[in-house]
Interface confidence: low
């Protein structure tokens, strides 16, 4: 066992926001996502707009703990999910062998110092394979209907094209601009630079020396220590609390 009070304290850590501090950060998530039964999905969150140090990230489904990534201790996957949950990429979580029961809300809870706790929400819908197939079939007539509608619209447009050419051009430009902005916005969101091998905390968020190396030995031991999680967090013999 490589840590003492640091562990129990840093891990038992429940970080509340500082009363005096402004929580400026924001959590960006993959939002609402769907996947096929039997498949896999990556849950991804990203904390931005804050210089706070990420001490730990919890992944929870409703009130069930899935996994923890602790800056000092590395990853811990809850025993009941070990077969189907894989850490990463980065601070994300990969769910495998999805079942319909996996449908629901997932939360990434970032414990930071000194800001406190940030929570992101992702809604996952797991679809039956057959439902997904039916959905694809229904899309064909739907596309046909859309095409017919477009033909009608185009005809109408052609009738008035001479009168509205200038306005139409402006309108198309505006729409293209909006689309471009949305696209750019989506590109802006991406997980931070990959962490060093074995690392769980973003390179820019972790203080020097934290999580920069594989902590396999510690993590293996942790399986003996991590029991039932009651709320949304951990501390260190200082491990029973936090690491400053």
């Amino acid at each position: 066992m490589r840590w003492c009070l640091l562990l129990i304290w840093a891990q038992g850590l429940r970080q509340a926001p500082l009363a005096s501090g402004m929580m400026t950060g924001t959590i960006e998530t993959t939002g609402n996502i769907s996947a096929e039964k039997g498949g896999s999905i990556i849950l991804q969150c990203h904390l931005s707009s804050t210089t706070a140090q990420v001490t730990q990230v919890n992944w929870e489904q409703q009130d069930q703990l899935l996994a923890i990534c602790n800056a000092d201790l590395g990853w811990h996957i809850s025993p009941s999910f070990k077969d189907r949950v894989a850490p990463g990429p980065g601070l994300g979580l990969t769910l495998q062998s999805l079942t319909v029961n996996d449908t629901g809300e997932y939360f990434c809870i970032y414990h930071t110092y000194p800001d406190g706790t940030y929570t992101g929400r992702i809604f996952l819908e797991v679809l039956e394979s057959s439902v997904a197939e039916h959905g694809a079939r229904f899309q064909i007539p739907l596309l046909g209907a859309m095409a017919a509608t477009l033909v009608v619209i185009c005809t109408a447009v052609i009738v008035v094209v001479a009168l509205t050419r200038k306005k139409k051009a402006l309108r198309i430009h505006s729409v293209e601009g909006d689309l471009r902005r949305k696209s750019a916005g989506q590109e802006e969101w991406s997980p931070s630079a990959p962490s060093p091998p074995g690392s769980c905390v973003q390179a820019e968020a972790a203080p020097a020396g934290l999580c920069g190396e594989q902590r396999g030995e510690d993590c293996a031991e942790l399986h003996d220590y991590f029991n039932v999680l009651s709320y949304r967090s951990l501390g260190n013999c200082s491990f029973f609390t936090e690491t400053g």
């Epitope: 066992m1 490589r2 840590w3 003492c4 009070l5 640091l6 562990l7 129990i8 304290w9 840093a10 891990q11 038992g12 850590l13 429940r14 970080q15 509340a16 923890i68 811990h76 110092y113 203080p207 020097a208 020396g209 934290l210 942790l222 003996d224 220590y225 991590f226 029991n227 039932v228 999680l229 009651s230 709320y231 967090s233 951990l234 501390g235 260190n236 013999c237 200082s238 491990f239 029973f240 609390t241 936090e242 690491t243 400053g244």
Partner: antibody, heavy 121, light 112 residues
Framework: EVQLVESGGGLVQPGRSLRLSCTAS????????MHWVRQVPGKGLEWVSG????????GYADSVKGRFTISRDNAKNSLYLQMNSLRAEDTALYFC??????????????WGQGTTVTVSS | DIVMTQSPLSLPVTPGEPASISCRSS???????????LDWYLQKPGQSPHLLIY???NRASGVPDRFSGSGSGTDFTLKISRVEADDVGVYFC?????????FGQGTKLEIK
């Protein structure tokens, strides 16, 4: 008033079991890590075990690993130490202690008065 | 495991005089976060221990400023600027960096 009260100590034969309890009052028990520390009369202090506020992290001294189990019930403001396969060398005064901080380490800032465990045939 | 060694084991002091206790660890207690995970506790006769200093040099709440902690890495010192009769007891250092946490053997301070 912040207070920790240990109970459950007593005389027990070698190889038998005993369960110590520590009841907390005067603070938000579920916010803090807790520890068990023991002291052989007239001797020094020995850290026995510690547990994070949410039971996620648990640690043991090598001398008790595999025999003692620490646990807590936040709803009851209680800390426990299940001691199995007791040995004569486990005879001591057992203190429970509160961790001082829930954001940064602040030492063990509150201690109980202790409960005596005597292992003898 | 980290071994903590205190000296002296016995310290007779005249009231009003300063006192100094040394604690040495077998490994550095300086964490990468910049903190030294070393505490000092005082156990008065017939009482439970109580916290004096945490993280090497931080005085616990209610502890008189006569007490100060210093040091880094493996060598630490607890100083009492002016000893009072109420300061008698056994002083313990504790390393809180690695599990298992470990205490020093204790230094018994007594009044001359």
């Amino acid at each position: 008033e912040v207070q920790l009260v240990e109970s459950g100590g007593g005389l027990v034969q070698p190889g038998r079991s005993l369960r110590l309890s520590c009841t907390a009052s005067g603070f938000s028990f579920d916010d803090y890590a807790m520890h068990w520390v023991r002291q052989v009369p007239g001797k020094g202090l020995e850290w026995v075990s510690g547990i994070s506020w949410n039971s996620i992290t648990i640690g043991y001294a090598d001398s008790v690993k595999g025999r003692f189990t620490i646990s807590r019930d936040n709803a009851k403001n209680s800390l426990y130490l299940q001691m199995n396969s007791l040995r004569a060398e486990d005879t001591a005064l057992y203190f429970c202690a509160k961790d001082g901080g829930n954001r940064k380490y602040y030492g063990m800032d509150v201690w109980g008065q202790g409960t005596t465990v005597t292992v003898s045939s | 495991d980290i071994v903590m060694t205190q000296s002296p084991l016995s310290l007779p002091v005249t009231p009003g005089e300063p006192a100094s206790i040394s604690c040495r660890s077998s490994q550095s207690l300086l964490h990468s976060n910049g903190y030294n995970y070393l505490d000092w506790y005082l156990q008065k006769p017939g009482q439970s221990p109580h916290l004096l200093i945490y993280l090497g040099s931080n005085r616990a709440s209610g502890v008189p400023d006569r007490f100060s902690g210093s040091g880094s890495g493996t060598d630490f010192t607890l100083k009492i600027s002016r000893v009072e009769a109420d300061d008698v007891g056994v002083y313990f250092c504790l390393q809180a960096l690695q599990t298992p946490c470990s205490f020093g053997q204790g230094t018994k301070l007594e009044i001359k």
